[in-house]
Interface confidence: low
């Protein structure tokens, strides 16, 4: 039970005090007791419960006619059962006794009031009165946890606006309200109570720029909401009528958790005694609600796809046809960014990452816009953000970034358990340098900080700086699987490719050609590839780099070798000994449920079938996956990207609720 104030009683004159239902009020009966008195008794109105404890050891007794020794070891506490109909209608009488004096009486007139600030602390999607049930001032994780949740109101319900909803002080309509969390102030007081008392709603100054609170006028349109707390207003005096009254507030977060903001916001209601205008306002009671701002959550390839994004560029009609067919098979919506809007920037994966935010009452997809800011710069903000589709960005918006800040370098694993620790929403994966040095690249610290601060998908730094482009999607992918952990990790594997080519040569196919059917591309015989010492050395280095990540992924995701599938792939080292794919990089695939869009490798055709395609099918089809090989050679591959780099996917949010995990 919440602690109330301390009330001092004195025999000289009656004491008047306020007691808030659900709080424990201490009675100081000693400090003003008559000098010669040695004991006391208490009588109270039926609406007041008095507890007397005399310790140690504490002997508890509710009031009766007993007398108690008057010493500091006696604790007297009051609680009230019902709110008062009129001021001071509950009475407590203390009688002091001494050996030589007649009893001396002290009177206490109590006013019982109900004041409670309620939010959805049980995370059911509904606000229930919580008085004396749970402590709302703490926020705890886990299925038995408690605490309310706020969404950053980062969508744009007003299509005529260019800003996010949280960037204005207005409530647009009921759609806008649904992105906010309801908080209710319930009061029950005597009619004249607020002539001498005031309620103040306030937020810590350190948190005022992270939240905005609107007060709703009950029964009126949402447009009657007015802002009461926010970046300019840390406190607000409430006009509350006496009697029984409920007041609704709608709360929106303005910032995601980040390195300087752990995501917790406390809203407090304070009851002030303003009866003596000569004295400062005295705080009689406080009630608080702690909210946690919902984190931005990424979705792995194992989540069902809902929408596919790609770019229309010069001469990629066939590519788009293939992606369209695949999207139709997977029953996905398809959004194409036209040429005039992408300004020849086809790398949809690099520009953005689509995740979501969730509260018990609402789930919202949110696009995380990378700071790479090339031709697709405006696409996330102009075409993706909208009603019920949020937006967030981090990092410098003008320069100061590297290729590792593009979101082909940002992936997330499916849910995993690692040495007993559960990651029910998976773990974020991004590429980094192997060790810091003058010429190494890394993801911008602002991006790293943001990803870590979300708390629910603890990031793992992989090593991708060995690649020319430097993105993790160039050597790994995840696909759904019906068994084991529910997925497989796919890793690009030069070792597996050399093994395959060697087998083909042993069977007499050494003359078979890589790149057959591609105009203006020098074709290569299997036997020449196998005898090319430089290429072998290049791929030996690449293999070591991928093995490095393999070990890291096994350790950080709790994987066994049987959870990993090696996809045959060769690389070549270019400028500064950085690697790029030797033929279309098959691991850089589009995963739409069981439908996979894989870069067509143009491998050696043996018995009428590409041996690389055949190998990949033999590895993935037993998992119930369907492989479609997409020709991206001239439109994507020679520009150092593939199918995954050129597409993006919005996926279904996890059914698991993030607040039920323990980070």
């Amino acid at each position: 039970m919440a602690q109330g104030t301390l009330i001092r009683v004195t025999p000289e004159q009656p004491t008047h005090a306020v007691c808030v239902l659900g709080t424990l009020t201490q009675l100081d009966i000693c400090s003003s007791a008559p000098e010669d008195c040695t004991s006391f008794s208490i009588n109270a109105s039926p609406g007041v419960v008095v507890d007397i404890a005399h310790g140690p050891p504490a002997k508890k007794k509710s009031t009766g006619s007993s007398t108690w020794p008057l010493d500091p070891g006696v604790e007297v506490t009051l609680t009230m059962k019902v709110a008062s109909g009129s001021t001071g209608d509950q009475k407590v009488q203390i009688s002091y006794y001494g050996p030589k004096t007649p009893p001396v009486k002290a009177l206490l007139y109590l006013t019982g009031v109900e004041i409670s600030l309620c939010a959805d602390i049980t995370r059911t999607g509904k606000v229930k009165p919580t008085r004396a049930v749970k402590d709302q001032r703490t926020w705890t994780w886990g299925p038995c946890g408690q605490g309310a949740i706020l969404l950053v109101n980062c969508d744009r319900d007003n299509l005529e606006s260019s800003a996010m909803d949280c960037e204005d002080d207005e409530v647009l309509d009921s759609e806008d309200l649904q992105d906010m969390s309801l908080m209710t102030l319930s009061t029950k007081t005597p009619k004249d109570f607020f002539t001498n008392h005031t309620l103040v709603l306030h937020v810590a100054r350190s948190e005022m720029d992270k939240v905005r609170v609107f007060q709703a006028t009950r029964g009126k349109l949402s447009s009657k909401c007015s802002v009461v707390l926010g970046p300019k207003w840390p406190s607000h005096y409430l006009m509350v009528p006496g009697g029984k009254h409920n007041m609704d507030f709608y709360v929106e977060a303005l910032a995601f958790p980040d390195t300087d903001f752990p995501g917790l916001i406390t809203l407090t209601i304070s009851l002030l005694d303003t009866s003596n205008l000569e004295l400062p306002e005295a705080v009689v009671f406080q009630d608080s609600v702690v909210f946690r701002v919902a984190p931005w959550i990424m979705t792995p390839n194992t989540q069902p796809p809902q929408e596919v994004y790609a770019c229309s560029i010069f001469e990629n009609e066939d590519f788009l046809k293939s992606v369209t067919t695949l999207a139709m098979k997977a029953k996905c919506k398809l959004t194409i960014c036209p040429e005039e809007e992408n300004m020849d920037d086809q790398w949809m994966q690099d520009e953005m990452e689509i995740g979501y935010i969730q509260a018990p009452h609402k789930t919202l997809p949110v696009v995380f816009d990378s700071p790479r800011n090339r031709g697709l710069k405006e696409f996330p903000i102009k075409r993706v953000m909208g009603p019920d589709f949020g937006y967030v960005t981090r990092g410098p918006q003008t320069g100061g970034i590297s290729g590792l800040d593009s979101f082909g370098n940002l992936e997330v694993s499916p849910p995993v358990t690692v040495r007993g620790k559960e990651y029910p929403l998976g773990r974020i994966l991004f590429g980094d340098s192997c060790y810091p040095s003058n010429d190494s690249r890394q993801m911008h610290q602002a991006l790293q900080d943001f990803l870590s601060a979300q708390q629910v998908q603890a990031p793992v730094k992989l090593y991708s700086d060995w690649l020319s482009v430097g993105h993790v999607d160039e050597f790994l992918s995840f696909v759904p699987a019906p068994d084991r952990k529910g997925f497989r990790l796919l890793l690009a594997s030069p070792r597996s490719c050399y093994k395959l080519f060697q087998e083909q040569q042993n069977e007499g196919h050494g003359e078979a050609l890589l790149f057959e059917g591609i105009k203006k591309k020098k074709q290569q015989k299997i036997k020449n590839i196998l005898s090319n010492k430089t290429l072998r050395e290049h791929n030996s280095f690449v293999e070591r780099c991928i093995d490095w990540n393999r070990e890291l992924l096994k350790r950080e995701l709790g994987l066994a070798e049987s959870d990993i599938i090696d996809i045959p792939q060769l690389f070549k080292l270019k400028e500064f000994s950085k690697a790029e794919a030797f033929f279309p990089n098959m691991v850089n695939m589009l995963v739409l449920g069981k439908h996979l869009g894989i870069p067509k490798p143009f491998g050696p055709v043996i018995n009428g079938r590409c041996c690389l395609e055949e190998k990949v099918c033999s590895l993935l089809e037993p998992l119930g996956l369907q492989c479609t090989f997409i020709n991206d050679f001239f439109t994507y591959h020679i520009r150092h990207g593939e199918v995954h780099c050129g597409t993006n996917v919005r996926r279904k949010p996890f059914s698991f609720k993030w607040w039920n995990m323990v980070p």
Epitope: P436, S437, Q448, R544, W548, E551, L552
Partner: antibody, heavy 119, light 109 residues
Framework: EVQLLESGAEVKKPGSSVKVSCKSS????????VVWVRQAPGQGPEWMGG????????HYAQKFQGRVTITADEDTSTAYMELNSLRSDDTAVYYC????????????WGQGTLVTVSS | EIVLTQSPATLSLSPGQRATLSCGAS???????LAWYQQKPGLAPRLLIY???IRATGIPDRFRGSGSGTDFTLTISGLEPEDFAVYYC??????????FGGGTKVEIK
């Protein structure tokens, strides 16, 4: 967890060299960086350099450049640190440690080798 | 090179008390590549915290690292008898110029 076993204590004369070995077990030697850190009596640790066996590239702290050689033998999972032109202020405990991915962050440490330089 | 300055040099506390150790860097430590080690006499240092705030495997949650840029803190929320030792901070962001702080000795009062 990786276990590291270092060679025994050495007493050396000024101007001579010392070569300390560090044998690794319980992990993939290739996938770790091995770093060398020394600690003079009553002082804080001092980073000397390190090597990633996988890339076979040693890195040396400026202070020791030209005087220290760090090598690794993948076959025996052993790393070596050789320090030349010894002086009395090189008297210290020399530790090898492995670091996993956070490249130069010592995680699992050897027991240390005391090298005393005295005439 | 980045110079790490630890303060105080010695901290005299009783078991159960909170210890707050500071480590200041002469310039910003990129990626928050800063670690904390505990060292007891005659033993090798033991990794407690890396990347400024991540607890190493097996380290009790009474050890907490915080900070970024140039100011870092190690907090031990309730000192246990086995926590009395020397603590070093270490930045590993600027290979090969990697440095350790001078140490803070936490002793029994």
């Amino acid at each position: 967890e990786v276990q590291l076993l270092e060679s025994g204590a050495e007493v050396k004369k000024p101007g001579s060299s010392v070569k300390v070995s560090c044998k690794s077990s319980g992990g993939t030697f290739n996938n770790y960086a091995v770093v060398w850190v020394r600690q003079a009596p009553g002082q804080g640790p001092e980073w000397m350099g390190g090597i990633i066996p996988m890339f076979d590239t040693p890195h040396y702290a400026q202070k020791f450049q030209g005087r220290v050689t760090i090598t690794a033998d993948e076959d025996t999972s052993t790393a070596y640190m050789e320090l030349n032109s010894l002086r009395s202020d090189d008297t210290a405990v020399y530790y090898c440690a492995t670091s996993y991915f956070r490249q130069w962050l010592p995680r699992d440490w050897g027991q240390g080798t005391l090298v005393t330089v005295s005439s | 090179e980045i110079v790490l300055t630890q303060s105080p040099a010695t901290l005299s506390l009783s078991p159960g008390q909170r210890a707050t150790l500071s480590c200041g860097a002469s310039q910003s430590v990129s990626s928050n590549y800063l670690a904390w080690y505990q060292q007891k006499p005659g033993l090798a240092p033991r990794l407690l915290i890396y990347d400024a705030s991540i607890r190493a495997t097996g380290i009790p949650d009474r050890f907490r690292g915080s900070g970024s840029g140039t100011d870092f803190t190690l907090t031990i929320s309730g000192l246990e008898p086995e926590d009395f030792a020397v603590y070093y901070c270490h930045q590993y962001a600027t290979a090969p110029q990697i440095t350790f702080g001078g140490g803070t000795k936490v002793e029994i009062k």
